[in-house]
Interface confidence: medium
């Protein structure tokens, strides 16, 4: 069937539309297009004869139409008047006629809208504002946006005039927002520029800051007033009812007791004509003395001495406060306060007790802080550490050892080799060492103030030959699927390559195996029972190589789900029942049995002689591994039949 499709159906003014013909018959003589829903010679747009390929304009031809050999009609530079129906009249070679009608609609391209307002400065809680979207356009839809969001639902918002007008009743300061309107028709959509609603409000009740109402004589009084207001409020200050100044801030330096009184801030909005006031009462007190801290021991020794800190001066009816590290006192059995809180005693001081300490005297209005006091806690020396950590050196290199021990005052250091004093320095340097420099190197750290001394001994071996290494482990009994194990190849030696073997083979590639620390450490993540192998480490340098004895990893695992044997579940009355339970586990698990939920014996084998049908039921084997903390179990149903009642039954054990 002959049909006409309009592409597009909705056409913007000035654009073009194609009336596309579908199912055009074969063997045509020609065709004509007409404006309207019927064939009317007065409304013919164009005719076309196929034989001559001649197009003939009709009375309705505007010069904007083009006809195609496939009978489709293109209309360009569309005008509003083009809206409507179009009829195609087809004349076949047998002079039989056929008709089809199509249509399209023309819409104007919308202009950019704008917003007009009936009130540019509405007053909060008093005025209404009506926004209108201009211009008025036929067949257009109107939409509104507030802060680029669609309109909220509110009883104070009302749309009218075909949504062209948005009215805000009883405006509030929260209505101060960006408003836009949008016009839409089938062919275009345009949005206006923003209009910001400027709502006049306030002043609200002013707030005076700071909130502090008590001051010390000699301080500066600096009060600031703020009231929410649009436009911003104008401020005035009154002291005890007397006007002082028209500023937002009131500053009075070096106040005295005479400055006590009521301080009023008045906020005024010239546009709304409203005034609001707030009053604060300021009290000025006479100056108390600044406290200070005295100590009974300025250089206490760690873990030996106690220190009593006292807050001076002593004033009757005064509250004393303490701070450590700018925090209030922590709860600690080593911290004790006297009954009047004036003395803070630190029992058995530690190096972490240095402070700073502050005390305070609290009066009616404020707290006076002392200057901070820092304790000089004498401590240490701790066990010295000798670096670097190498123990093996090759002949001809320089040996440079450094010693450090935490200490206050800083430690004095001495070096001994094989028990003999060498020098009183923190660093020991020996150039071009030989095998003779092998020995016990002792660093002695001494604290002259506490009189304490600590030593650390390091064994140094100088040899071209490497020693036989050994493997240390951080976990001798790891649990399967839970623990990691780190093997370390000892000793640490300079210019040495570290190698590893597992069961005599080089390390397999595995994401669970990781080498670190210059290949000196081998870490096995998430160990499994298959990791229970022999591990060997090797060390080598340019002149020698050596391997450690193997270390076998003892992986704790299981218990796995147990197996009860024999597998038979049917027995004849009078047979012996002999069930054995086995579960893979390291170490071997503990076994126990339950029959029909009732605990039996703690053995791996359950034996019942001459069973009867009374022995029917569920037989559960429970296994537990105390080392892994894991348990497992399995249940087996046993059926005992009277002799000869069933073929194929087990004769028992």
């Amino acid at each position: 069937k002959l049909t006409i499709e309009s592409t597009p159906f909705n056409v913007a003014e000035g654009k073009e539309v194609l009336l596309l013909v579908h199912n055009l018959p074969q063997h045509l003589f020609g065709y004509s297009w007409y404006k309207g829903e019927r064939v009317d010679g007065n409304r013919q747009i164009i005719g076309y004869v196929i034989g001559t390929q001649q197009a003939t304009p009709g009375p309705a031809y505007s010069g904007r139409e083009i006809i195609y050999p496939n009978a489709s009609l293109l209309i360009q530079n569309i005008i509003q008047n083009d809206t409507g129906f179009y009829t195609l009249h087809v004349i076949k070679s047998d002079l039989v006629n056929e008709e089809a009608t199509g249509q399209f609609r023309v819409y104007p391209e919308l202009p950019k809208p704008s917003i007009s307002s009936n009130n540019s400065k509405p007053v909060e809680d008093k005025d209404a504002v009506a926004f209108t979207c201009e211009p008025e356009t036929q067949d257009a839809t109107y939409l509104w946006w507030v802060n680029n969001q669609s309109l909220p639902v509110s009883p104070r918002l009302q749309l009218s005039n075909g949504n062209r007008t948005l009215t805000l009743f009883n405006v509030t300061r929260n209505d101060t927002a960006s408003y836009k309107c949008e016009t839409q028709n089938p062919v275009s959509a345009r949005r206006s520029d923003s209009v910001i609603l400027n709502v006049l409000y306030g002043p609200d009740a002013p707030t005076i800051s700071p909130l502090n109402t008590s001051y010390r004589s000699g301080e500066n009084l600096n009060l600031s007033c703020h009231a929410a207001s649009n436009p911003p409020a104008q401020y005035s200050w009154f002291v005890n009812g007397t006007f002082q100044q028209s500023t937002q801030e009131l500053f009075i330096p070096n106040i005295t007791v005479n400055n006590s009184g009521s301080y009023t801030c008045q906020a005024h909005n010239s546009d709304t004509g409203l005034n609001r006031t707030t009053v604060t009462t300021i009290t000025v007190y006479a100056e108390p003395p600044k406290p200070f801290i005295t100590s009974n021991n300025s250089n206490p020794v760690e873990d030996e001495d106690a220190v009593a800190l006292t807050c001076e001066p002593e004033i009757q009816n005064t509250t004393y406060l303490w701070w450590v590290n700018n925090q209030s006192l922590p709860v600690s059995p080593r911290l004790q306060l006297s009954n009047d809180n004036r003395t803070l005693t630190l029992l058995s001081v530690t190096r972490n007790d240095v402070g700073p300490y502050e005390c305070g005297i609290q009066n009616e209005l404020s707290v006076d802080h002392s200057d901070p006091v820092i304790l000089n806690v004498l401590y240490g020396p701790d066990d010295p550490t000798i670096s670097p950590s190498y123990t093996y050196y090759r002949p001809g290199v320089n040996l440079s050892l450094s010693c450090h021990a935490a200490s206050n005052p800083p430690a004095q250091y001495s070096w001994l080799i094989d028990g003999n004093i060498q020098q009183h320095t923190q660093e020991l340097f020996i150039s071009n060492i030989t095998e003779k420099n092998s020995g016990l190197y002792t660093c002695q750290a001494n604290n002259s103030a506490s009189g304490h001394s600590r030593t650390t001994v390091k064994t140094i071996t100088v040899s071209a030959e490497l020693p036989k290494p050994s493997i240390s482990s951080n976990n001798s009994k790891p649990v399967e699927d839970k623990d990691a194990v780190a093997f370390t190849c000892e000793p640490e030696a300079q210019n040495t390559t570290y190698l590893w073997w597992v069961n005599g083979q080089s390390l397999p590639v595995s994401p669970r195996l990781q080498l670190s620390n210059g290949n000196r450490t081998l870490t096995l993540f998430n160990v499994t029972r298959n990791d229970a192998r022999a591990y060997v480490c090797g060390i080598q340098n340019s002149v020698s190589a050596n391997r450690s004895d193997p270390v076998t990893l003892d992986v704790l695992y299981g218990p796995d789900t147990p197996i009860i044997s024999p597998p038979d579940s049917s027995y004849l009355s009078g047979a012996n029942l002999n069930l054995s339970c086995h579960s893979a586990s390291n170490p071997s698990p503990q076994y126990s049995w339950r029959i029909n939920g009732i605990p039996q014996q703690h053995t791996q084998v359950l034996f019942i002689a001459k069973i009867t049908p009374n022995n029917n039921g569920t037989y559960a084997c429970f296994v537990s591994n105390l080392a892994t903390g894991r348990n497992n179990s399995i249940v087996k149903s046993i059926t005992v039949s009277a002799s000869g009642t069933s073929p194929g039954l087990s004769a028992g054990a």
């Epitope: 092998s438 001994v457 000892e490």
Partner: antibody
């Protein structure tokens, strides 16, 4: 073969001095500390001291300070022990020894090579 | 000085059995992973011979029936099984500071 060859027995008068020798073969003494040990008849072992033949550094057990003097001559690969102001208390076998020639070792005072000993008898 | 006390002073053990000799130090002779205690055997008329170094390491050429153990202040020399040629005096020696020897233990075989 690594060896320490000690000088023969000495019979000396009380108050006199004696100097015994210890010659190394199979190794160079300047590469090792040389030690001396005293053993009185039917008694235990006492360490006298060590010498570093390379630079002549010495260290003595407090008991032998002033009594013993250790020296070396590394051109002849020999170490010497001299004992002065001899008394009957000095009658003993004196061994020279050294450390760690045949094993990896981590301290200088470790004696795995010993001389056969020099017997010193002090007569009044 | 570190004083080494050996016990017993003398010991008689039947052939094939175990001999155990103890050595106690007046302060620890262990440091940085090593124990600086060594054992010697001295047969009559001969110089001492190194058996064990660093508490538990068997000197090259020494039979495996000799073993050493211990750390800190308490050390032990074990001989098992005892053979006739083991009749000798055994000394412990430390090298943690200036070296000293124990008083010796005389082992006789019956």
């Amino acid at each position: 073969e690594v060896q320490l060859q000690q000088s023969g027995a000495e019979l000396v008068r009380s108050g006199a001095s004696v100097k015994m020798s210890c010659t190394a073969s199979g190794f160079n003494i300047k590469d090792y500390y040389m030690h001396w040990v005293k053993q009185r008849p039917e008694q235990g072992l006492e360490w006298i001291g060590w010498i570093d033949p390379e630079n002549g550094d010495t260290e003595y057990a407090p008991k032998f300070q002033g009594k013993a003097t250790m020296t070396t001559d590394y051109s002849s690969n020999t170490a010497y022990l001299q004992l002065s102001s001899l008394t009957s208390e000095d009658t003993a076998v004196y061994y020279c020894n050294t450390r760690g020639l045949s094993t990896m070792i981590t301290t200088r005072w470790f004696f795995d090579v010993w001389g056969a000993g020099t017997t010193v008898a002090v007569s009044s | 000085d570190i004083v080494l006390t050996q016990s017993p002073a003398s010991l008689t053990v039947s052939l094939g059995l175990r001999a155990t000799i103890s050595c106690r130090a007046s302060k620890s002779v262990s440091a940085s992973g090593y124990s600086y205690m060594h054992w010697y055997q001295q047969r009559p008329g001969q110089p001492p011979k190194l058996l064990i170094y660093l508490a538990s390491n068997l000197q090259s050429g020494v039979p495996a029936r000799f073993s050493g153990s211990g750390s800190g202040t308490d050390f032990t020399l074990n001989i098992h099984p005892v053979e006739e040629e083991d009749a000798a005096t055994y000394y412990c020696q430390h090298s943690r500071e200036l070296p000293t020897f124990g008083g010796g233990t005389k082992l006789e075989i019956k």
